[in-house]
């Protein structure tokens, strides 16, 4: 995904997980200069910004995801010990210095571990 100096690649657009797993929302980007990276989460319960940062600087993590998310300079984020309510749409937006952006969507499905699955 390339536009006006920003490119963004999402290797896996749909992720299936079970509760308590740590999940990597993996992306790769390239652009001229240092971009602003923003992740938002949306579900039927609403939408919220998870985190925003410029690579190489401290990430501004929302209160709802404090201690539950970790950022990487390649734009990826890791979610710790996910629950069913973490299911939904995760949209990354990479914005370069001149103002143009690229976005991509990852859908996360989190399911309970069923007893019969363990046997």
């Amino acid at each position: 995904l390339q536009s006006q100096g920003v490119s963004l690649y999402i290797p896996q657009a749909t992720i299936n997980a079970t509760v308590k797993e740590d999940i990597l929302l993996s992306v790769e980007y390239s652009c001229h200069g240092v971009p602003t990276i923003e992740w938002t989460y949306s579900s039927n319960w609403g939408t919220q910004k998870i985190v925003e940062w410029k690579p190489g600087t401290q990430a501004n993590i929302s209160q709802s995801h404090k201690d539950r998310v970790c950022t990487f300079d390649n734009g990826s984020i890791q979610l710790f010990s996910v629950g069913v309510r973490d299911s939904g749409y995760y949209v990354i937006t990479v914005t370069e210095r001149l103002g143009s952006s690229q976005f991509g969507t990852i859908v996360l499905h989190v399911s309970e571990i069923l007893y019969e699955d363990l046997h």
Epitope: L1, A13, S42, S43, Y89, V91, F103, G104, T105
Partner: antibody
Framework: EVQLVESGGGVVKPGESLRLLCTAS????????INWVRQAPGGGLEWVSS????????YYADSLEGRFTISRDNAKNSVTLEMNSLRVEDTALYYC????????????????WGQGTLVTVSS | EIVLTQSPATLSLSPGERATLSCRTS???????LAWYQHKPGQAPRLLIY???NRATGIPARFSGSGSGTDFTLTISSLEPEDFAVYYC?????????FGGGTKVDIK
């Protein structure tokens, strides 16, 4: 009823500029993404640019190579597409299109369409 | 970018027949991020389906969308005379937003 009216199209020479204006009515303008989609003569639909409502994020097609700039004025219910260094291949009917109301997810599909304004780039 | 390939390019059918239009994406895309449009000469395109399978306001029940992963389908259960047009699919899961090349449904 949502109405989108485009203006500013015309005939220009390669390398020249044009400014397209889209004026909207019948919607809470500041809650909607606004997009430009074009159709070259005999061709299919091609997305050009989008501007979100809340975040103001801006997206462009790769082929534009920095030549176009989109902006919005919520007070005037309008969106402008500034087109510079125009090329023959930019010749098309340019549609202004609203997305769905921004509720809980970025949804850049195209709900309400204007009738389009024709841009012809010819030497 | 995600490339959308529509087939067939042209579909020649009679009123009352069932039309099945295909849209294939170059990368797996959540069905929630696919839309279908109808375009008639001299008119603006019209949104038919969004979210893969949701009919837009005012769209008759004979239009339905389905599919997941990389394969999506628009079905017109029984063609009416006003349904003969060009149909486009569009993905909006990632930028750049992209359209398929279109399928023309014409009268046999």
């Amino acid at each position: 009823e949502v109405q989108l009216v485009e203006s500013g199209g015309g005939v220009v020479k390669p390398g020249e500029s044009l400014r397209l204006l889209c004026t909207a009515s019948g919607l809470s303008f500041n809650k909607y993404s606004i997009n430009w989609v074009r159709q070259a003569p005999g061709g299919g639909l091609e997305w050009v640019s989008s501007i979100e409502s809340g975040s103001g994020h801006i997206y462009y097609a790769d082929s534009l190579e920095g030549r176009f700039t989109i902006s919005r004025d919520n007070a005037k219910n309008s969106v402008t597409l500034e087109m510079n260094s125009l090329r023959v291949e930019d010749t098309a009917l340019y549609y202004c299109v609203s997305g769905p109301e921004d509720k809980w997810l970025l949804q850049l599909y195209f709900e309400s369409w204007g009738q389009g304004t024709l841009v012809t780039v010819s030497s | 970018e995600i490339v959308l390939t529509q087939s067939p390019a042209t579909l020649s059918l009679s009123p009352g027949e069932r039309a099945t239009l295909s849209c294939r994406t170059s990368q797996s895309s959540p069905s929630d991020n696919l839309a279908w449009y109808q375009h008639k000469p001299g008119q603006a395109p019209r949104l038919l389906i969004y979210g893969g399978s949701n009919r837009a306001t005012g769209i008759p029940a004979r239009f339905s969308g389905s599919g997941s992963g990389t394969d999506f389908t628009l079905t017109i259960s029984s063609l009416e005379p006003e349904d003969f047009a060009v149909y486009y699919c569009q993905q909006y899961g990632s930028s750049p937003l992209t359209f398929g090349g279109g399928t023309k449904v014409d009268i046999k």
